[in-house]
């Protein structure tokens, strides 16, 4: 079982990032830690998408990783996609420090995110509370600014 993974986020614009994942035990939480730069100040949706396919840019990654066929939600919600990691917050310098602990994603098993795509979005994720159909699918987080395939790390 992999205990560490890494993702290098890149896009067409200035947004780039490095996100590290660590899971000490197979059923334990995953630490998600790193940084993303080139963002506008404020909240940006942050999700694991289903496919590790970036052939046509971030759009090839498909929808949020959702093996349980649930509605979109926030990371603390029972009703959420596995890939729903909520928002990252960029400061006035355009840098978002990421420090998340999530107990739904995994680096092994049915919820394994390795080989899938991590995406940072243009807008805030409304965590499924936006009151429209798109909210229950994407959180109205808008376009995909940068993405990268999550790979096993040393």
């Amino acid at each position: 079982m992999a205990t560490k993974a890494v993702c290098v986020l890149k896009g067409d614009g200035p947004v780039q990032g490095i996100i590290n994942f660590e899971q000490k035990e197979s059923n334990g939480p995953v630490k998600v830690w790193g940084s993303i730069k080139g963002l506008t100040e404020g909240l940006h949706g942050f999700h694991v998408h289903e496919f590790g396919d970036n052939t046509a840019g971030c759009t090839s990654a498909g929808p949020h990783f959702n093996p349980l066929s649930r509605k979109h939600g926030g990371p603390k919600d029972e009703e959420r996609h596995v890939g729903d990691l909520g928002n990252v917050t960029a400061d006035k310098d355009g840098v978002a420090d990421v420090s998340i602990e999530d107990s739904v994603i995994s680096l092994s098993g049915d919820h394994c995110i390795i080989g899938r795509t991590l995406v940072v979005h243009e807008k805030a994720d409304d965590l499924g509370k936006g009151g429209n159909e798109e909210s229950t699918k994407t959180g109205n987080a808008g376009s995909r600014l940068a993405c990268g395939v999550i790979g096993i790390a040393q």
Partner: antibody, heavy 119, light 107 residues
């Protein structure tokens, strides 16, 4: 207030190793990235590598790859930089410096540790 | 590796003068460029972060500008205590690199 306190000056023989420590206080140690930068006498600043203590991940400059090891002891909020196979050109002041995360500047620096390599 | 080239290497200036130091990156680094001051026998101190933002406690006579590949550190109305070496630093990509430094001497 963040403080980085380094170990004292060292005199080493060529071919030997040196291990310099850097103890952090005044902040959440796990959310730092600690880098090591050296400065030879009368010269500029040279980045050697960094460690992310929360993940035990270290990155090294290619020039030092295989010769330097950076480790962290989270229980004491201390980072160590070990440099092997010392040569006279390694005579320098070695600084540890803190940054909040990737892409950010080094906002706090240790006082420096002079390492002299001489036979 | 991103190479940072500072200009000039050395400058001798009189108090109250305006000083400009430039830093050119070998490829675009956006605004991930920072400036440090280092006085003799002291550790470097952060002056300017992200090309143009003053770090806390830094006197207002220090300012920075630029983005992409060309950056400038300006010291308005130089004071005697500003005699030091000044370094630019990029945090855009690994390996992290520094400029070769600019030494300011006060006449």
């Amino acid at each position: 207030q963040v403080q980085l306190v380094q170990s004292g000056a060292e005199v080493k023989k060529p071919g030997s190793s040196v291990k310099v420590s850097c103890k952090a206080s005044g902040g959440t140690f796990n959310n730092f990235v600690i880098g090591w930068v050296r400065q030879a006498p009368g010269q500029g600043l040279e980045w050697m590598g960094r460690i992310i203590p929360i993940l035990d991940i270290a990155n090294y400059a290619q020039k030092f790859q295989g010769r330097v090891t950076i480790t962290a002891d989270k229980s004491t909020s201390t980072v160590y930089m070990e440099l092997n196979s010392l040569r006279s050109e390694d005579t320098a002041v070695y600084y540890c410096a803190r940054t909040g995360n990737y892409y950010k500047p080094y906002d706090y620096w240790g006082q420096g540790t002079l390492v002299t390599v001489s036979s | 590796e991103i190479v940072l080239t500072q200009s000039p290497d050395f400058q001798s200036v009189t108090p109250k003068e305006k000083v400009t130091i430039t830093c050119r990156a070998s490829q675009s680094i956006g605004s991930s460029l920072h400036w440090y001051q280092q006085k003799p026998d002291q550790s470097p101190k952060l002056l300017i972060k992200y090309a143009s933002q003053s770090f806390s406690g830094v006197p207002s006579r220090f300012s920075g500008s630029g983005s992409g590949t060309d950056f400038t550190l300006t010291i308005n109305s130089l004071e005697a205590e500003d005699a030091a070496a000044y370094y630019c630093h990029q945090s855009s990509s690994l390996p992290i690199t520094f400029g070769q430094g600019t030494r300011l001497e006060i006449k």
